[in-house]
Amino acid sequence: LRPSRVHNSEENTMRALTLKDILNGTFSYKTFFPNWISGQEYLHQSADNNIVLYNIETGQSYTILSNRTMKSVNASNYGLSPDRQFVYLESDYSKLWRYSYTATYYIYDLSNGEFVRGNELPRPIQYLCWSPVGSKLAYVYQNNIYLKQRPGDPPFQITFNGRENKIFNGIPDWVYEEEMLATKYALWWSPNGKFLAYAEFNDTDIPVIAYSYYGDEQYPRTINIPYPKAGAKNPVVRIFIIDTTYPAYVGPQEVPVPAMIASSDYYFSWLTWVTDERVCLQWLKRVQNVSVLSICDFREDWQTWDCPKTQEHIEESRTGWAGGFFVSTPVFSYDAISYYKIFSDKDGYKHIHYIKDTVENAIQITSGKWEAINIFRVTQDSLFYSSNEFEEYPGRRNIYRISIGSYPPSKKCVTCHLRKERCQYYTASFSDYAKYYALVCYGPGIPISTLHDGRTDQEIKILEENKELENALKNIQLPKEEIKKLEVDEITLWYKMILPPQFDRSKKYPLLIQVYGGPCSQSVRSVFAVNWISYLASKEGMVIALVDGRGTAFQGDKLLYAVYRKLGVYEVEDQITAVRKFIEMGFIDEKRIAIWGWSYGGYVSSLALASGTGLFKCGIAVAPVSSWEYYASVYTERFMGLPTKDDNLEHYKNSTVMARAEYFRNVDYLLIHGTADDNVHFQNSAQIAKALVNAQVDFQAMWYSDQNHGLSGLSTNHLYTHMTHFLKQCFSLSD
């Protein structure tokens, strides 16, 4: 819901966005995701920090945990045990990497209104979770896994070999956290809490990245992280399952790796419990075009896990890597053997398939020149999923329901016509058995969250509509946004253009390209945002464009896999092509064109600046990759193969930023990096800077001491202020 355009007489009461607005988060929005605890109940933290239980059917709500109790231990998070007898309270949050953090945990007994005393949890804990039934606890402390039958009981130590930076039990190492699991945990309870599965990562042989953390002491600390760069030794992973009732009986039992996977380097990619005695593991060859899904069963007689070859399902890509960004995970149906999964169909579009016996005999559930993106829930009679089918806009997300109980299955778009102008990009959150669900709309209008009946899809209530934000934006001159496409040489390039409020096609405007462009990414999305580029358009009169070129997602494998084994070529070409098309539109000042990007976007912006086209006057690279030999094995090799002579070393060498140092001579380049970047190491920018100095090319640079890949806190303000000055100077805009 964008504030509507006003008449000129009112225009003088409207103001442009300021940089301060952006840095203060003045126009940030809220979403409402219910914390479902049953088919019809959810928990939510109220504005005054009470934890409230809502019952949709009775309409009643009551506080299960007061803000006073939360405050007594400075809790920033909570978790209710499934039997509703205990709540864990999380405090002393200490961030580690993207998902991981440590914290102190207190257990509050709801039956007597007291904290559990005796056998308190150690601190700091790396991960803690309740069993899905009852109130067993599993937690990771100092890289070892512990089990508690109940919060007040002494713990049972499951693993003993955990060692910092060497052996990780129940939590991922750096590369598995960032590039494979995308979680802080690597343990999984079976549905009724009978078994606990966990991963052990052995990083003993992985080379270590070391960087200085300056802090405030006389001597800097050295941070050491086992981090496999492309071609390096990888972690060795093993999966174990332990019976939580009799953990000492046979101890942890290792789940066998499929023979075709174990024959060379491999990864574990995910674990899905099917029943208490059936588990599904997914494995991936190091050359990530072959994935194996293995269904394993518990053998009571031997107390072991059996993974018959007949229950191995192979997914292979002949045109690229397996899956999208990750290999998709299965959603099992009620028979506990067949499942639904998203993978490429014969036309090269990712779609939902139903697998009953073999992948070859899979039944395709969705089809078309669009993609199914996520399967939310499968019930006895319905399958809920999201896709970008509606009106052929790849940057939209709508929620669909397919009736699987009837034949032929009927499809209904749940969201397409709800708030058509305001809401075109949805996600959903379902209660048990999909009795109810919440829809969270991210835009293009002001985000709104609503509650719906799972049977009728009827809207029950608005959970969050961001009224204050709507009111705050009433006197703001927001930029105009349009999403359109360019057709170039049989390639469709979708773009989003952000235009100044009083945009006039007959005038000339400076153009800023914002690029990410990484494999399986999408920048052109129908979502709401008031951010730095909104300010640049609103206040500084720039046109900003985002372009999804080759390598980006949700438009079919042809576009996605075009960059396979040759990163840094087509992504850059497509940005350049789009700029040329924008110039042809007549309102771009071709002497004032800039490009900027962060991370992969910093790599692309650097290569675009060094393309020798003369199109760009200036550009910014924030925390860029500069050579694929410097980045993580799991990510890099997925798209590039190995940096060996007999594989793809030549393109690794050809695709560096350093190799193009000479070409920066005719552009203004601002290079920015955090010195404590655990992800894209400062090494990347250090090597760019060295190459530019060696080529005697002038450039600007900014480092952020002790900052990681996110450049957060005060660094954020400094960063955006600095980049604003740089762009205004480049575009000859007065300060």
Epitope: D153, F160, A248, Y249
Partner: antibody, heavy 118, light 107 residues
Framework: EVQLVESGGGLVQPGGSLRLSCAAS????????MSWVRQAPGKGLEWVSW????????GYADSVKGRFTISRDNSKNTLYLQMNSLRAEDTAVYYC???????????WGQGTLVTVSS | DIQMTQSPSSLSASVGDRVTITCRAS??????LNWYQQKPGKAPKLLIY???SLQSGVPSRFSGSGSGTDFTLTISSLQPEDFATYYC?????????FGQGTKVEIK
């Protein structure tokens, strides 16, 4: 506070039967493995039997296998030991104990004396 | 079955003494070894679980160590209330077995 209270002990003739009970309170009984341990007069401790939380799995010492049956009623928070074909060597104080993780006995009852004698 | 052998079977010590009791398993039991204290006419009481973890409420003068087959219970400074019989117990294979006991008497 965890409490385990045994009852049902007494004097019984060889070949006779006896049923011991153990009333549990102060914890979620249905969530734990429960066990019986005995101690003959002036002797050491001997484990007798255990039963899984839901009651579907049991274990017995060789010395009582086939004669003793362990059971539980989770709705009544009670553990039982049915002792048949009793022998003189079964004379002991019988303790009800919680067998945490199937590994250690963290709470014990006060015991009930069973005397098998003619 | 796994046999547990405790030594000594009895010992005499004075208040303030450091007392060590050992327990040997007939095969490796990892760290699944527990120690109990029993006073005459009373039920046993858990002191140490998992070889070295102190049960809640047990004084810190009690400590346990070892893994595999050899284990030790140490009382760093014997107190009057510590005169009792001590039992080790293995919990490896759902067939718990106890040592024969060590009686700690006043010298």
């Amino acid at each position: 506070e965890v409490q385990l209270v045994e009852s049902g002990g007494g004097l019984v003739q060889p070949g006779g039967s006896l049923r011991l009970s153990c009333a549990a309170s102060g914890f979620t009984f249905r969530g734990y493995i429960m066990s019986w341990v005995r101690q003959a007069p002036g002797k050491g401790l001997e484990w007798v039997s255990w039963i899984s939380p839901e009651g579907s799995r049991t274990g017995y010492a060789d010395s009582v296998k086939g004669r003793f049956t362990i059971s539980r009623d989770n709705s009544k928070n009670t553990l039982y030991l049915q002792m048949n074909s009793l022998r003189a060597e079964d004379t002991a104080v019988y303790y009800c104990a919680r067998l945490l993780y199937g590994t250690w006995f963290d709470y014990w009852g006060q015991g009930t004396l069973v005397t098998v004698s003619s | 079955d796994i046999q547990m052998t405790q030594s000594p079977s009895s010992l005499s010590a004075s208040v303030g003494d450091r007392v060590t009791i050992t327990c040997r398993a007939s095969q490796s039991i990892s760290s699944y070894l527990n120690w109990y204290q029993q006073k005459p006419g009373k039920a046993p009481k858990l002191l140490i679980y998992a070889a070295s973890s102190l049960q809640s409420g047990v004084p810190s003068r009690f400590s346990g160590s070892g893994s595999g087959t050899d284990f030790t219970l140490t009382i760093s400074s014997l107190q009057p209330e510590d005169f009792a019989t001590y039992y080790c117990q293995q919990g490896r294979l759902l067939l718990p077995t106890f040592g024969q006991g060590t009686k700690v008497e006043i010298k």
